[in-house]
Interface confidence: low
């Protein structure tokens, strides 16, 4: 079974998805649509890596522009150095700036 | 009704620089949902993919014309417009504007074309 | 760069009969296929997306199958206006390169 066949049957499943099982999700060629990555946890979410989210989405990567605004994304963003977002290519705005020396993530949350 | 409207010179000299602009009408550039495309076809041959932009003007470029492109919008004027330079008889092409989902890389509207042709 | 490869280059198919055409990708899209038809003189329609979803207006009789590297498109019973050149399209990419088939021109026999 393929990465995208896998991702069909378990697509029902994955809006309560640890960040465990989203990081393993990501090295499996999934390409999740980003419909179903706006009904993700956003505690599972907000640990994810740049490089993770955009193995997670393959091309639909692109749509996290549309939904800067909106909850999980915003929040990662949030979380999300200034440099790192800046390799999409999306015009991302929000992340930490660059040089700032990140103490506490959790922090932002309290924050934003 | 959404509308595209390539326009340009028909011919451009060698090693001179290609511009084309699309005008969008019926239809919001600056909608969050789409991106808008350029792509051309060789009189004869097949298509490919030159770039896309975004309302924003974060754009991307096909790989092997990147060095020589540039792809801008301006939401005022409701046109995104394209930029090509050092061009050789080999950039002779119909060039197509062309809207695309920002959730898929696929182009489901597109304007008639225009033929630019590269000679002195 | 994915390179699609698009077979036959030409089809001869009588009206009313089924046409099968082939799409190859160098490497696996997933399910993220297009496909187009081009009749001579006109810019390119969006005929299928997502490997087998009908573009909006495009009539039952085109379908579109297959996933990873392996694509077909049928047409069940051929109408005058289907005799074209038809595109397969990637878009599995990420940073975009989106690349299409060299075509398919389907002629009547």
């Known amino acids: 079974m393929n990465g995208s066949e896998y991702f069909v049957k378990i697509q029902s499943f994955l809006g309560g998805a640890p960040t465990e099982d989203l990081k393993a999700l990501s090295q499996q060629n999934v390409s999740m649509d980003l419909a179903t990555f706006m009904k993700l946890r956003t505690d599972a979410v907000l640990p994810l890596t740049v490089a993770e989210v955009q193995k997670l989405l393959g091309p639909h990567v692109e749509g996290l522009k549309a939904e800067e605004r909106h909850r999980p994304v915003r929040d990662w963003i949030l979380r999300q150095r200034q440099d790192d977002l800046d390799t999409l290519g999306l015009g991302l705005q929000g992340g930490i700036p660059n040089g700032y020396l990140v103490l506490d993530l959790s922090m932002q949350e309290a924050l934003s | 009704q959404l509308q595209l409207q390539e326009s340009g010179p028909g011919l451009v000299k060698p090693s001179e620089t290609l511009s084309l602009t699309c005008t969008v009408s019926?239809?919001?550039?600056?909608?969050?949902?789409?991106?808008w495309g350029w792509i051309r076809q060789p009189p004869g041959k097949g298509l490919e993919w030159i770039g896309s932009v975004y309302y924003s003007g974060s754009a991307f470029y096909s790989p092997s014309l990147k060095s020589r492109l540039n792809i801008a919008v301006d939401t005022s004027k409701k046109q995104f417009s394209l930029k090509l330079s050092s061009v050789t008889a080999a950039d002779t092409a119909v060039y197509y504007c062309a809207r695309r989902p920002y959730k898929s890389g696929l182009f489901d509207f597109w304007g008639q074309g225009t033929l630019v042709t590269v000679s002195s | 760069e994915i390179v699609m490869t698009q077979s036959p280059a030409t089809l001869s198919v009588s009206p009313g009969e089924r046409a099968t055409l082939s799409c190859r990708a160098s490497?696996?899209?997933?399910?993220?296929l297009a496909w187009y038809l081009q009749k001579p003189g006109q810019a390119p329609r969006l005929l299928i997306y997502?490997?087998?979803t009908r573009a909006t207006g495009i009539p039952a009789r085109f379908s579109g199958s297959g996933s990873g590297t392996e694509f077909t498109l049928t047409i069940s019973s051929l109408q005058s206006e289907d005799f074209a050149v038809y595109y397969c399209?990637?878009?599995?990419?990420?940073?975009?390169?989106?690349?299409f088939g060299q075509g398919t021109k389907l002629e009547i026999k």
């Open positions: 019926g239809g919001s550039i600056s909608s969050s949902s789409y991106y």
């Open positions: 399209q990637q878009y599995n990419t990420w940073p975009p390169e989106y690349t």
């Open positions: 490497q696996s899209v997933s399910s993220n």
């Open positions: 997502g490997t087998s």
